[in-house]
């Protein structure tokens, strides 16, 4: 008799999820000498242990603690780049500027990037059919709790000047409900972080507006200032040119003409 299976509103676990996580772990630890000591089988076991046999609407940060412990990693605390709704450009940037790090440049972020996963209560099966959607089903699902946990830890580790890349093409450039707005902003440590510098990325070729004056940016500035952290904002009018000029700052096309 086929077992009844809970139908969730979100997509199911990414196909070949265990193999993908294990392969990514092996690749990451080969590329990053400081993480060579990591045992990827243990990492997978800890990852699996966080959600297998558990109700996918009842996951806690505590469930991920064994994985967090195994994935402990020190990144230079003054070289952190946060992002919101503009992941691809943030990753392109850290590929060029190799001494800066997004969450997805760390082992745990790299393992889970773009993947979905969930299990079922009381069975050891992975659910490849559907997983809970954050809005329609529940917020304490395996994926959301994972990202909340690693994002909080990443923000807590930051120091000095922290940078955040924001999407200037969206109606809410700063969104209080994003992971950045709901988790990272509130977990920056004022005793360690001097300044949050926002980079507002412009989409339009001819867009010369000062998006640092946008009401949502002013809201971000207010939240940050109340937390005793200085705030700074830059308009990145030409993101393609910005990446090119980060690569080669001496290129004459990077300097304003007199």
């Amino acid at each position: 008799v086929p077992r009844w299976r809970q139908q969730w509103s979100g997509p199911g676990t990414t196909k070949r999820f265990p193999e993908t996580v294990l392969a990514r772990c092996v690749k990451y630890t080969e590329i990053h000498p400081e993480m060579r000591h990591v045992d990827c089988q243990s990492v997978w076991d800890a990852f699996k242990g966080a959600f297998i046999s558990k109700h996918p609407c009842n996951i806690t940060e505590e469930d991920y603690q064994p994985l967090m412990k195994l994935g402990t990693q020190t990144v230079p605390c003054n070289k952190i780049l946060l992002w919101s709704r503009i992941k691809d450009l943030a990753h392109q940037f850290t590929q060029v500027q190799r001494d800066m790090f997004t969450l997805e440049d760390t082992l745990l972020g790299y393992l889970a990037d773009d993947l979905t996963w969930c299990g079922e209560f009381n069975t050891s099966k992975i659910n490849y059919q559907s997983c809970p959607d954050w809005r329609k089903d529940c917020s304490n699902n395996p994926v959301s709790v994972f990202w909340k946990t690693v994002s909080r830890r990443f923000a807590e580790a930051a120091c000095d000047v922290v940078h955040v890349m924001l999407n200037g093409s969206r109606s809410k450039i700063f969104d209080k409900n994003s992971t950045f707005g709901s988790v990272e902003v509130h977990n920056l440590q004022p005793e360690k972080v001097q300044t949050l510098e926002a980079w507002v990325i412009h989409g339009g070729r001819e867009d010369s507006r000062d998006l640092c004056q946008d009401p949502t940016i002013k809201e971000l500035e207010s939240i940050i200032s109340k937390r005793n952290i200085q705030f700074s904002c830059k308009n990145i009018y030409r993101p393609d040119k910005f990446l090119q000029c980060v690569k080669n700052p001496e290129d004459s096309s990077c300097t304003s003409e007199i």
Epitope: Q194, K234, Y237, P249, T255
Partner: nanobody, 115 residues
Framework: DVQLQASGGGSVQAGGSLTLSCRYS?????????MGWYRQAPGNQRELIAT????GKTNYKDSVQRFIISRNDTTVTLQMNRLQPEDTAVYYC???????????WGQGTRVTVSS
């Protein structure tokens, strides 16, 4: 909040010298972007008069070849030699990048040259 504040202005006789200074914070954009000195004479638009790249490559408006722009990790400096009355203006420092917009403009520093 203003991250760029020019200082060092004042009144000087024609032929004299002044050195303007501008500190900026440790954000990444300043570290990788060209910086510039701008000036705004009474009744005129603000104009870019000198730029310097991260590596120290400089460029000047023809009329200010007497000036020398320099920078380190936190400061951009403008050494103004053989000053003339037409150099009277408010001077500002800011980014001089084709990719990144100018930062919030500070108060600037006033230079007055009398003949």
């Amino acid at each position: 909040d203003v991250q760029l504040q020019a200082s060092g202005g004042g009144s000087v006789q024609a032929g004299g010298s002044l050195t303007l200074s501008c500190r900026y914070s440790g954000g990444f954009v300043f570290r990788v972007s060209s910086m510039g000195w701008y000036r705004q004479a009474p009744g005129n638009q603000r104009e870019l008069i000198a730029t310097i790249t991260v590596g120290g490559k400089t460029n000047y408006k023809d009329s200010v070849q007497r000036f020398i722009i320099s920078r380190n990790d936190t400061t951009v400096t403008l050494q103004m030699n053989r000053l003339q009355p037409e150099d009277t203006a408010v001077y500002y420092c800011n980014l001089a990048s084709t990719a990144v917009g100018a930062d919030t403009w500070g108060q600037g520093t006033r230079v007055t040259v009398s003949s």
